[in-house]
């Protein structure tokens, strides 16, 4: 899998896509997940509702939502009131019994807001990821009215 | 296999000025967050200052904001850094580092260069 | 900031000890802390990171355990390239901060 990079902003909203072959993927729930580590585990963030024909209803974990078009074979994941340390590798996978297959592989990289003039280094949060070749950036930016959320934090 | 070489290193009075560049090969550059980390002699270890994958945002440890700048080419693999106003307190081994994106540790390190600021 | 502390500064082993060094924050920061190793003359090399994740290559010996605000790295039968200094890192949420070290010494 290639790699796509979707650029946000701190404070912001950042909107991934995923788009996958809804015949292919017929009946299965999605979820996204969070590369901790180069090979390391991906670790769930959030997933579609228990109810396949429910997917297209939103699910939040923290700041983190989901929802799913298995019509239009698009998985969409909302990250709210962005943050620096939630820059990163994630995947979105389209999931069967035990087994995930990743439908996408995203870089999330977190810009730090022009227009706040707050140091740069309270919101700060940096880190890294796994080589991909070729990747494509995809500007995803809307201005966010939510504040105060709480990123997800990894657990082990 | 991911490799970091840094150079520019060597001695400069202070309030002089040195730039230093870290070649990087062994992995797709443009796509990862890199940083500067540093080590003064005997002591332990310092991150100094990182910019995510695009260039487009930079961020600095308190004790070298405004007189440190960090830079990336992304079409030479090479990141750098303009040090400015340096301090007898700024010699130290200087690492390029690649950082993991969201998590802040640093996965792997160039073998390092010196910075000596004295008179 | 928050403030990371290794105990002990230095600590004596020989090969096939089973050792353990800590790390001790000033606040709670969940499971997120990596560990490094340096040996004289050389750059640091992750060991670990979200506290229990080996990185590529590192021997199954060592391990890392805690949460919240105390921290602990064991090796668990020392080899003689073990002998060196290890440094924890309070990762995810920045500063990023470095506790000052211990290191591991042959007996």
């Known amino acids: 899998h290639n790699t796509t990079v979707f650029q946000g902003v701190a404070g912001q909203s950042l909107q991934v896509s995923c788009p996958y072959d809804s015949m292919k993927h017929w009946g299965r729930r999605k979820a996204w997940c969070r590369q901790l580590g180069e090979k390391g585990p991906c670790q769930r963030v959030v997933s579609t509702h228990n109810l396949w024909l429910l997917s297209f209803l939103r699910r939040w974990n923290g700041s983190t939502a989901i929802t799913d078009d298995t019509l239009g074979g698009t998985l969409t994941i909302t990250l709210r009131n962005l943050q620096p340390h939630d820059a990163g590798l994630y995947q979105c996978q389209s999931l069967h019994g035990s087994e995930a297959d990743t439908l996408r592989k995203v870089l999330v990289e977190v810009l730090a807001d022009p227009l706040d003039h707050r140091d740069a280094g309270d919101l700060w949060f940096p880190g890294e990821s796994e080589s991909f070749e070729d990747a494509h950036v995809e500007h995803s930016i809307s201005r966010s009215l939510l504040e105060g959320e709480i990123p997800f934090p990894p657990t082990s | 296999e991911v490799q970091l070489l840094e150079s520019g290193g060597g001695l400069v009075q202070p309030g002089g000025s040195l730039r230093l560049s870290c070649a990087a090969s062994?992995?797709?550059?443009?796509?990862?967050?890199m940083a500067w980390v540093r080590q003064a002699p005997g002591k332990g270890l310092e991150w100094v200052s990182s910019l995510t994958n695009s260039g487009g945002s930079t961020y600095y440890a308190d004790s070298v904001k405004g007189r440190f700048t960090i830079s990336r080419d992304n079409s030479k693999n090479t990141l750098y850094l303009q040090m400015n106003s340096l301090r007898a307190e700024d010699t130290a081994v200087y690492y390029c580092?690649?950082?993991?994106?969201?998590?802040?540790?640093?996965?792997?390190w160039g073998q390092g260069t010196l910075v000596t600021v004295s008179s | 900031d928050i403030q990371m502390t290794q105990s002990p500064s230095s600590l004596s082993a020989s090969v096939g000890d089973r050792v353990t060094m800590t790390c001790k924050a000033s606040?709670?920061?969940?499971?997120?802390l990596a560990w490094y190793q340096q040996k004289p003359g050389k750059a640091p090399k992750l060991l670990l990171y979200y506290t229990s994740n080996r990185f590529t290559g590192v021997p199954s010996r060592f391990s890392g355990s805690g949460s919240g605000t105390d921290f602990t790295l064991t090796i668990s039968s020392v080899q003689p390239e073990d002998f060196a200094t290890y440094y924890c890192?309070?990762?995810?949420?920045?500063?990023?901060?470095f506790g000052q070290g211990t290191k591991l010494e042959l007996k």
């Open positions: 890192q309070r990762i995810y949420n920045s500063p990023w901060t």
């Open positions: 580092t690649r950082e993991w994106a969201g998590s802040g540790y640093f996965d792997y």
């Open positions: 606040q709670n920061v969940g499971n997120n």
């Open positions: 062994g992995f797709t550059f443009s796509n990862y967050y």
